[in-house]
């Protein structure tokens, strides 16, 4: 009955502070409406990074001010988080909820440890 969610253990953000990873879920039924939430866990505190609800076959739509973008393909969601800095290094958990049709299912991944390294400032040129 439990819904399994898989995501990579580790991802390294690029020099522009962008990190991408795939969140894949094993759907116990044929969901038509899915909500994907990215959570950040630091110590024992969990906070929401971004969330999107989408209809199967349609694009994910995050809020305009979201730092996340994404695309879906079947039971896979390709997530991209932008604007990351070194202080944002941490565990990012993918949570998937099958909102419709019944029954509701929720699945939580084990988390992706995203490492962010701030770029070195360019040396002044004479």
């Amino acid at each position: 009955k439990a819904m399994h969610v898989a995501q990579p253990a580790v991802v390294l953000a690029n020099s522009r502070g962008t990190a991408s990873f795939v969140c894949e879920y094993a759907s116990p039924g044929k969901a038509t409406e899915v909500r994907v939430t990215v959570l950040r866990q630091a110590d024992s505190q969990v906070t929401e990074v971004c969330a999107a609800t989408y209809m199967m076959g349609n694009e994910l739509t995050f809020l305009d001010d979201s730092i996340c973008t994404g695309t879906s393909s079947g039971n896979q969601v390709n997530l991209t988080i932008q604007g990351l800095r070194a202080m944002d290094t941490g565990l990012y958990i993918c949570k998937v909820e099958l909102m419709y049709p019944p029954p509701y299912y929720m699945g939580i991944g084990n988390g992706t440890q995203i490492y962010v390294i701030d770029p070195e400032p360019c040396p002044d040129s004479d």
Epitope: A2, M3, Y105, I108
Partner: antibody, heavy 118, light 108 residues
Framework: QVQLVESGGGVVQPGRSLRLSCAAS????????MHWVRQAPGKGLEWVTF????????YYADSVKGRFTISRDNSKNTLYLQMNSLRAEDTAIYYC???????????WGQGTLVTVSS | EIVLTQSPGTLSLSPGERATLSCRAS???????LAWYQQKPGQAPRLLIY???SRATGIPDRFSGSGSGTDFTLTISRLEPEDFAVYYC?????????FGQGTKVEIK
């Protein structure tokens, strides 16, 4: 701090209606799914109904399906439970509860007592 | 529907003793989706453990959870006077959300 405050309970005759409210504060209400859970006198906890973030998706226990309606007003940070065709077996303390980020019910209201009696 | 069965119904112990409460599911529950709650008379339930073994904010470390699949356990290592209460397990991975019938931990 997170607070959930239920109201609207009372004594009502069988077959009549009642509407419960749950006022939420201390968090961004629209970012959380919500539930109603009830507890009959001296008994255990029984999940009653669930509502999604925007109120679009709702789920009900078989015991209340077709009689109870859950709704929410995100602009007022308030959760509602409309209870129609009440029965004696609906007598209980009704709690509203917030779904935590990882799924458990992390905050509960203090409860409101509904007594269905003639 | 996942049915949760708790045992024993009542546990009579003295302060300082160890309490072991069991919760058995009728079908597999992912460990990420099992919680324990404490309820004292006249109060709302309080979340103790989620994800089978993670303590909720502010919960003392004498409370611990374990288990997977269909068998889960809540352990209170040394009972304090304020721990005498009713404890419920719950699964929250799929609808309908279900609770066990509760275990009452009473003073012997």
């Amino acid at each position: 701090q997170v607070q959930l405050v239920e109201s609207g309970g009372g004594v009502v005759q069988p077959g009549r209606s009642l509407r419960l409210s749950c006022a939420a504060s201390g968090f961004t209400f629209s970012h959380y799914t919500m539930h109603w859970v009830r507890q009959a006198p001296g008994k255990g906890l029984e999940w009653v109904t669930f509502i999604s973030y925007d109120g679009h998706n709702k789920y009900y226990a078989d015991s209340v399906k077709g009689r109870f309606t859950i709704s929410r007003d995100n602009s007022k940070n308030t959760l509602y439970l409309q209870m129609n065709s009440l029965r004696a077996e609906d007598t209980a303390i009704y709690y509203c509860a917030r779904t935590g980020w990882l799924g458990p019910f992390d905050y509960w209201g203090q409860g409101t007592l509904v007594t269905v009696s003639s | 529907e996942i049915v949760l069965t708790q045992s024993p119904g009542t546990l009579s112990l003295s302060p300082g003793e160890r309490a072991t409460l069991s919760c058995r599911a009728s079908q597999e529950v992912g460990e990420s989706y099992l919680a324990w709650y404490q309820q004292k008379p006249g109060q709302a339930p309080r979340l103790l453990i989620y994800g089978a073994f993670s303590r909720a904010t502010g919960i003392p470390d004498r409370f611990s959870g374990s288990g997977s699949g269909t068998d889960f356990t809540l352990t209170i290592s040394r009972l304090e006077p304020e721990d005498f209460a009713v404890y419920y397990c719950q699964q929250y991975g799929s609808s309908p959300w279900t609770f066990g019938q509760g275990t009452k931990v009473e003073i012997k």
